[in-house]
């Protein structure tokens, strides 16, 4: 019987509000033994895959997806999935990347810490939430 794969988690360094032209790194985490991590934006059809997987702890592996110079087109909802043979996991929660014009003001920090791992509430009417998952065989429209 195939094991039930835990859902991955996703976070962003240094945060989820990034000034135009700055860098951001998405960190996807899953169990040990992951062969491929996939970072999706908005839809399964827009993704990047990596097999550059490192061990983050004895029970956890991770992959890092870096965008060197963030553009407005990088804004959106991101999530991770992974492939641990012989199957794909379910999707992580979504993480929203906001791209803002640099203000440089001392009282307004450029970034906010961002991660998305646990369950979220069902969207209320004013929710700024949306939903999507893992996929094989779709043509990649690369993120960056």
């Amino acid at each position: 019987q195939e094991e039930d794969l835990p859902r991955p988690s996703i976070s962003a360094e240094p945060g989820t509000v990034i000034p135009l032209g700055s860098h951001v790194t998405f960190v996807c985490r899953g169990p040990v033994g992951v062969q491929t991590f996939r970072l999706e934006r908005d839809s399964r059809s827009t993704y990047n895959d990596t097999e550059d997987v490192s061990q983050a702890s004895p029970s956890e592996s991770e992959a890092r997806f870096r965008i060197d110079s963030v553009r407005e087109g990088n804004a959106g909802l991101y999530r991770c999935i992974y492939y641990k043979p012989p199957k794909w996991s379910e999707q992580s929660d979504y993480l929203e990347l906001l791209v803002k014009e640099s203000s440089g003001g001392p009282d307004s920090p450029d970034t906010e810490p961002g991660s998305s791992a646990g369950p979220t509430q069902r969207p209320s009417d004013n929710s700024h939430n949306e939903h999507a998952p893992a996929s094989q065989g779709l043509k990649a429209e690369h993120l960056y």
């Epitope: 934006r41 999530r79 999935i81 999707q91 929203e96 949306e130 939903h131 999507a132 998952p133």
Partner: antibody, heavy 119, light 107 residues
Framework: EQSVESGGGLVQPEGSLTLTCKAS????????ICWVRQAPGKGPEWIAC???????TYYASWAKSRFTISKTSSTTVTLQMTSLTAADTATYFC??????????????WGPGTLVTISS | ELVMTQTPASVEAAVGGTVTIKCQAS??????LAWYQQKPGQPPKLLIY???TLESGVPSRFSGSGSGTEFTLTISDLECADAATYYC?????????FGGGTELEIK
């Protein structure tokens, strides 16, 4: 709070039409809006989506050449349709799509607007 | 393009009984699946999202399961009001594909 479609009606074959999805009591900020149609006696058929978080548009392969989804304001999304044929006769729905965790939630549907293509 | 195959196309069941509707995705869609109920002249009504999460206000007689490519909707303790057409849908905004529907008749 609701979304309402308008702009349907009777159109001649090869004609064009623009449908509007208007939010009432909320704006579409950071949601996605999708258009779905349903021909008489048939099942729903996805047409296109507009993502407010990324400003990206997504289309069913059959719809790409004749349908255009656009955001016209924070409370309005339109669907432009060209070269219409009898096969496009259907009720057209817009749906507001939120997120729940890592999955999308198509929870709010308008009542639909009927488009009839006939000479 | 992703295809959602729904079975059976129609089913008849008795009040108080149980029905199971299956939906198969042509590619792995993880948990991105919703189930809808539709009655004539109305838009689809969301019953279940994320494959197994019950929409607010929907009776617990409705349940969903599955992940990846195989999904199931189960309706137990059937009532006359459950007579309708049921659809599965891939909820990804880049796909949005619906199954062909299952017409449920209550006898």
């Amino acid at each position: 709070e609701q979304s309402v479609e308008s702009g349907g009606g009777l159109v001649q074959p090869e004609g064009s039409l623009t449908l509007t999805c208007k939010a009432s009591g909320f704006d579409f900020s950071r949601n996605a809006i999708c258009w779905v149609r349903q021909a008489p006696g048939k099942g729903p058929e996805w047409i296109a989506c507009y993502s407010f978080s990324s400003s990206a548009t997504y289309y069913a392969s059959w719809a790409k050449s004749r349908f255009t989804i656009s955001k016209t304001s924070s409370t309005t999304v339109t669907l432009q349709m060209t070269s219409l044929t009898a096969a496009d006769t259907a009720t057209y729905f817009c749906a507001r799509v939120d997120i729940y965790g890592g999955s999308r939630y198509w929870g709010m549907w308008g009542p639909g607007t009927l488009v009839t293509i006939s000479s | 393009e992703l295809v959602m195959t729904q079975t059976p196309a129609s089913v008849e069941a008795a009040v108080g009984g149980t029905v199971t509707i299956k939906c198969q995705a042509s590619q792995n869609i993880g948990g991105d699946l919703a189930w809808y109920q539709q009655k004539p002249g109305q838009p689809p009504k969301l019953l279940i999202y994320r494959a197994s999460t019950l929409e607010s206000g929907v009776p617990s007689r409705f349940s969903g399961s599955g992940s990846g490519t195989e999904f199931t909707l189960t309706i137990s303790d059937l009532e006359c009001a459950d007579a309708a057409t049921y659809y599965c849908q891939d909820t990804d905004i880049g796909s949005g594909a619906f199954g062909g529907g299952t017409e449920l008749e209550i006898k």
